[in-house]
Amino acid sequence: ALDTNYCFRNLEENCCVRPLYIDFRQDLGWKWVHEPKGYYANFCSGPCPYLRSADTTHSTVLGLYNTLNPEASASPCCVPQDLEPLTILYYVGRTPKVEQLSNMVVKSCKCS
Amino acid sequence: ALDTNYCFRNLEENCCVRPLYIDFRQDLGWKWVHEPKGYYANFCSGPCPYLRSADTTHSTVLGLYNTLNPEASASPCCVPQDLEPLTILYYVGRTPKVEQLSNMVVKSCKCS
């Protein structure tokens, strides 16, 4: 699986999850998030050669088409597969609130 | 929606579904498919600027990050959203068989 366990331990050029730390205030302009100050959102990147973690029949077909037609511009792309939520603390005035934000952290990637 | 209705009628540079005809024999080397000879598989391509048909909170966050950090290499990618099956005819010996292959045709795209 193209997950953090594999991708963060290997120098993988092809589609894999990559570490990306986002600072809420500096990178997003979100002043309302109190904690954490930032988090590892991660992202997916890298080429999708034929049969690499293909998501659907279409991505397999497209990968094969690309292999047999190297000049073609159509190829699968490396995108998130599994995402996890992030728990944040914010304030409504002076009152603290805890919220779980869904689909915030990429844990694995696929070729789609 | 970034679907065939919209994308095939407009000269859209950003993420959209593009027409791609695949000939089973010539492009894939699939001699076993008798009918059709080929089909419009289509594919997704084009940049994913901030907020363009974002798939999840993560892709929106990544798009925002990319907007505020233009030098960043992390950005959402244009991939299939809705896929449709394709019905094919093939032969087992002299016996014709009809099969529905799932997820063969891209109908719309998203930024993921």
């Epitope: 302009g29 309302w32 304030y91 005035g93 | -």
Partner: antibody, heavy 120, light 108 residues
Framework: QVQLVQSGAEVKKPGSSVKVSCKAS????????ISWVRQAPGQGLEWMGG????????NYAQRFKGRVTITADESTSTTYMELSSLRSEDTAVYYC?????????????WGQGTLVTVSS | ETVLTQSPGTLSLSPGERATLSCRAS???????LAWYQQKPGQAPRLLIY???SRAPGIPDRFSGSGSGTDFTLTISRLEPEDFAVYYC?????????FGQGTRLEIK
């Protein structure tokens, strides 16, 4: 610099609903927190609630809970305020405003206002 | 909910004079949860002061805010003709956000 452009004036019957839109341009929409404030004719200002775009966290004044819904559509950089079960005392100018960044905060940029008249 | 009481209700002064507007909260707001706005007829409010004493961008330095706890003041050191308007204080320490009833500053 943020510009907030609101939808036009509305005349509504008692018991009906109204949905006012507020389109943002300028500073990135999803870095803003948007509040809604109303002002009855010749009266003061009254906060109704606010929303954090992207994550759609909304906070409402208790007196409007169950009657007001504030949502954000990131794809169009637009915030909506829907008020249901309208009565004559809901006749007011409705403003959207971007806060300085917190959920409850001072409001630095304001829309031009939308007059909602509730009359039978 | 926190009630804000502004005084006076109306203030009649001449250009060049000093204006002092008061805002009292029904409970302590700390030192940084109060804002002041100016509103002219037919216009949206305009933020003058936030955090009790910080001037918003583009606001002339004749406007100043002070105070903490329950008592806050907006001072306009030398009134200009364009300063005659209605002024509101706003608290954002607790939900719901509340506004004072306003002080009308009129030309004497």
């Amino acid at each position: 610099q943020v510009q907030l452009v609101q939808s036009g004036a509305e005349v509504k019957k008692p018991g009906s609903s109204v949905k006012v839109s507020c389109k943002a341009s300028g500073k990135t929409f999803s870095s803003n927190v948007i509040s809604w404030v109303r002002q009855a004719p010749g009266q003061g200002l009254e906060w109704m609630g606010g929303v954090i775009p992207i994550v759609d966290i909304a906070n409402y004044a208790q007196r409007f809970k169950g009657r007001v819904t504030i949502t954000a559509d990131e794809s169009t950089s637009t915030t909506y305020m829907e008020l249901s079960s309208l009565r004559s005392e809901d006749t007011a100018v409705y403003y959207c405003a971007s806060t300085l960044g917190l959920v409850l905060d001072a409001m630095d940029y304001w829309g031009q206002g939308t007059l909602v008249t509730v009359s039978s | 909910e926190t009630v804000l009481t502004q005084s006076p209700g109306t203030l009649s002064l001449s250009p060049g004079e000093r204006a002092t507007l008061s805002c009292r909260a029904s409970q302590s707001l700390g030192s940084s949860y109060l804002a002041w706005y100016q509103q002219k007829p037919g216009q949206a409010p305009r933020l003058l002061i936030y955090g009790a004493s910080s001037r918003a961008p583009g606001i002339p330095d004749r406007f100043s805010g002070s105070g903490s706890g329950t008592d806050f003041t907006l001072t306009i050191s030398r009134l200009e003709p364009e300063d005659f308007a209605v002024y509101y204080c706003q608290q954002y320490a607790d939900s719901p956000i509340t506004f004072g009833q306003g002080t009308r500053l009129e030309i004497k």
